[in-house]
């Protein structure tokens, strides 16, 4: 009933709650003396379904048979229409259409932790569209039955608030859920389990790790667990890895030795627990413990390379370079590098510790046989030293690799290729490909890069420290015992026309010809490896095409003679530079008039 219904009644048969597809009879009847004031025969009763008229009848009552009602609630309202007045609401009724509950499926119960409470979940099946009450029952030992009702509209979970205790862990419990509404009831199949089946332990806590004698090989993981835990799973991984190592342990009693950890590595550790070998479920994983393993002495050997530079008749400069050990080889924080320089015949030795960088430069006599040894040290010890005999790396011409070429290979890569030396190629023990940014001054502070290649290789892809639009001086060394031969080439990974031309800084007259001097183009404006310079000249105020002279680019060259100028004629001169991608714009213009006699 939806209002006071003073004027009449609406009755619904067989019930206000019906099964989907059922028919209902709705009767609207006026109470005595509640019809139209003068003309009771003119009473017009109208039945509305929500706001839509579905039936009407003249008289004191109206009967209507209604079919095809949808799931859910439908509102019917009966109104009275009298002549010359608005319709008056008589009464109304709501009809609830639904279905009986389906049998609840997949009932399962769990207790989180030995101190937790039992909660069960199930699948309700299709919506009944009616108020449906769920009652969960749990029968256990000691002739007790627990029961709880769910008042939620969509109920598929109930927590009993009961903590099962392990007095008899093998005792059986039986759970059952029953759904009841106005159209029927249905019970799930019973679910039978023991304490051990449904208790899911809490995850382990208070996880710690200890390294005995600060050694990675003597490592024990400790944790705390609930009292009944029998099994543990451990998983651990380096913090930068996605793959876990897994270990299963039985009766660990809160400790386990780990034997395969890598030194000086941050690991993440997690543990899970279970009460029984084949019953019950694993706990969630514990919170992660992150810990760094102790250092061990370095393994592996440093990759060492060197450069020799002539200073004067008695002295030479040696620059040593080495690469960092990989993390797995360093096995700790490298505190310093130890460099030992020794004259092999006289036995004189000098040792120095280098911190903070991976190069060392010294000056030694040009006489004598020199060797160096370089090792890396952490808090636990040193790597095996890498020994190198200092020799003239390019002295053996017959060992020089042939037909060296350098070609761009995608973004910031250069493919270097060569042919074996003329001398017996089988004598080559290894090739070293070295590259550094080309600096016109031959600056020794420019970082040096190198890679080693096996003797049967005739190419190498260089990608480390390669920048676009920079020219690199590339050398390929063939090493054989105490001899070496080398070839060099210039190369870039990407190039375009230079951004500017050379700046002419002086023009001088010498015996009827001129010498033009210029400043090198700044490295950042060269845009790759320069191939040529061009010198242009033409008579001042002339419209004729300029003449030009093309000079192959050489790193150290910054002057060039021209002897085809006429005396006492004023010329305008300028220069450009070329890479494989094209020619630069003009450099500055200079005027010059040769003073020499006319022919």
């Amino acid at each position: 009933k939806i209002d006071a219904c003073k004027r009449g009644d609406v009755t619904v048969k067989p019930s206000h709650v019906i099964l989907l597809g059922s028919t209902v009879n709705i009767t609207c009847s006026l109470k005595p003396r509640q019809g139209c004031f003068h003309y009771s025969r003119r009473n017009k009763l109208i039945l509305y379904k929500f706001d839509r008229r579905i039936n009407f009848h003249h008289g004191h009552s109206l009967n209507s048979q209604v079919t095809g009602l949808p799931l859910g609630t439908t509102l019917f309202v009966c109104k009275l229409a009298c002549i010359n007045s608005d319709e008056i609401q008589i009464c109304g009724a709501e009809i609830f259409v639904g279905v009986a509950p389906e049998q609840p499926q997949n009932l399962s119960c769990i207790q989180k932790g030995e101190q937790g409470t039992v909660a069960c979940t199930w699948e309700r099946g299709r919506d009944t569209h009616l108020y449906t009450e769920y009652t969960l029952q749990l029968s256990g030992p000691k002739n007790l039955t627990w029961q709880k009702q769910c008042k939620d509209i969509y109920c598929d979970y109930l927590d009993f608030g009961i903590n099962l205790t392990p007095e008899s862990p093998e005792s059986n419990f039986t759970a059952k859920v029953t759904a009841v509404n106005s159209l029927g009831s249905s019970s799930s199949l019973p679910s039978t389990f023991t304490f051990l089946d449904i208790v899911r332990p809490l995850p382990p806590w208070d996880i710690r790790i200890k390294f005995q004698k600060a050694s990675v090989s003597r490592c024990t993981l400790y944790w705390r667990d609930e009292g009944l835990v029998l099994l543990n799973r451990l998983r651990y991984r380096p913090s930068n890895s996605r793959l876990w190592n897994m270990v299963n342990v039985t009766k660990a009693k809160g400790r386990h030795d780990l034997l395969d950890l890598k030194p000086f590595t941050e690991y993440e550790f997690q543990i899970s627990s279970k009460l029984h070998l084949y019953k019950g479920s694993w706990s969630d994983w514990s919170e992660s413990l992150r810990a760094q393993t102790p250092e061990e002495e370095p393994t592996g050997m440093l990759d060492v390379w060197y450069m020799k530079r002539h200073i004067d008749y008695s002295r030479q400069q040696i620059s040593l370079f080495w690469k960092n050990l990989s993390v797995s080889e360093a096995r700790g924080k490298i505190l310093h590098y130890q460099v030992t320089l020794q004259e092999l015949t006289g036995g004189k030795a000098m040792t120095q510790n280098i911190t903070g960088h991976t190069s060392w430069t010294t000056v030694i006599p040009r006489t004598g046989n020199w060797a160096v040894a370089v090792s890396a040290a952490n808090s636990k010890g040193s790597s095996l030293p890498t020994r190198i005999n200092i020799m003239n790396l390019c002295e053996a011409g017959l060992l020089a690799p042939r037909q060296v070429s350098a070609n761009s290979e995608g973004m910031d890569n250069i493919l270097v290729t060569w042919q074996p030396p003329r001398k017996d190629p089988s004598a080559v023990q290894e090739y070293v490909v070295e590259w550094r940014e080309l600096h016109p001054g031959g600056d020794t502070q420019v970082p040096l890069n190198w890679l080693r290649s096996r003797p049967y290789n005739v190419s190498a892809l260089i990608s480390e420290n390669i920048k676009s639009y920079i020219c690199y001086e590339i050398r390929v060394y063939a090493l054989s015992g105490d001899q070496g031969g080398c070839s060099s080439i210039l190369g870039n990974s990407k190039h375009k026309a230079p951004l500017s031309g050379p700046h002419i800084n002086a023009i001088t007259e010498e015996k009827g010809s001129i010498l033009i001097s210029w400043n090198s183009i700044p490295v950042q404006e060269q845009m790759g490896c320069l191939l040529h310079y061009r010198i242009y000249w033409k008579e001042r105020d002339s419209n004729s095409q300029p003449q030009l002279c093309e000079i192959p680019y050489r790193v150290s060259q910054n002057s060039h003679p021209i002897n085809s100028l006429q005396p006492r004629v004023t010329y305008v001169l300028w220069m450009t530079a070329l890479t494989a991608a094209g020619e630069s714009s003009h450099g500055n213009e200079r005027e010059f008039c040769l003073q020499g006699k006319a022919n």
């Epitope: 409470t117 256990g140 000691k142 007790l144 627990w146 029961q147 709880k148 009702q149 927590d159 009993f160 608030g161 009961i162 903590n163 099962l164 205790t165 007095e167």
Partner: nanobody
């Protein structure tokens, strides 16, 4: 002073129904477990039913599906509705209150876990 007072007992024919009430005073029992026990001469008190503070009902299997326990926290009163009574249900029925809402499964059925007791009300089922 805490008091529990039972009422509603009496003589009833087998198959009949009775509703026992337990009115509490002196403290609020809405957060406590409340239980009904019964005792016949010469025997120990036997657990009948309990209702926890989370409204979980607990029944002895002998009365399951026949008895229903409920509570009205606003009135601080607890009820035991008994249907289909049998001759063996004849006993003095006691209302008992817990100090707090324990959740351990072992405490509901043990009289020693209930510090508060009523005086009892006699239920007699005749043939």
């Amino acid at each position: 002073q805490v008091q529990l007072q039972e009422s509603g007992g009496g003589l009833v024919q087998a198959g009949g129904s009775l509703r026992l009430s337990c009115a509490a005073s002196g403290r609020t029992f809405s957060k406590s477990t409340m239980g009904w026990f019964r005792q016949t001469p010469g025997k120990e008190r036997e657990f009948v039913a309990a209702i926890t503070w989370t409204d979980t009902e607990v029944y002895a299997n002998s009365v399951k599906d026949r008895f229903t326990i409920s509570r009205d926290n606003a009135k601080n009163t607890f009820y035991l509705q008994m249907h289909s009574l049998k001759l063996e249900d004849t006993a003095v029925y006691y209302c008992a209150g817990d100090r707090y809402g324990s959740s351990r499964d072992s405490v509901f059925s043990s009289p020693t876990n209930y510090p508060y007791w009523g005086q009892g009300t006699q239920v007699t089922v005749s043939s």
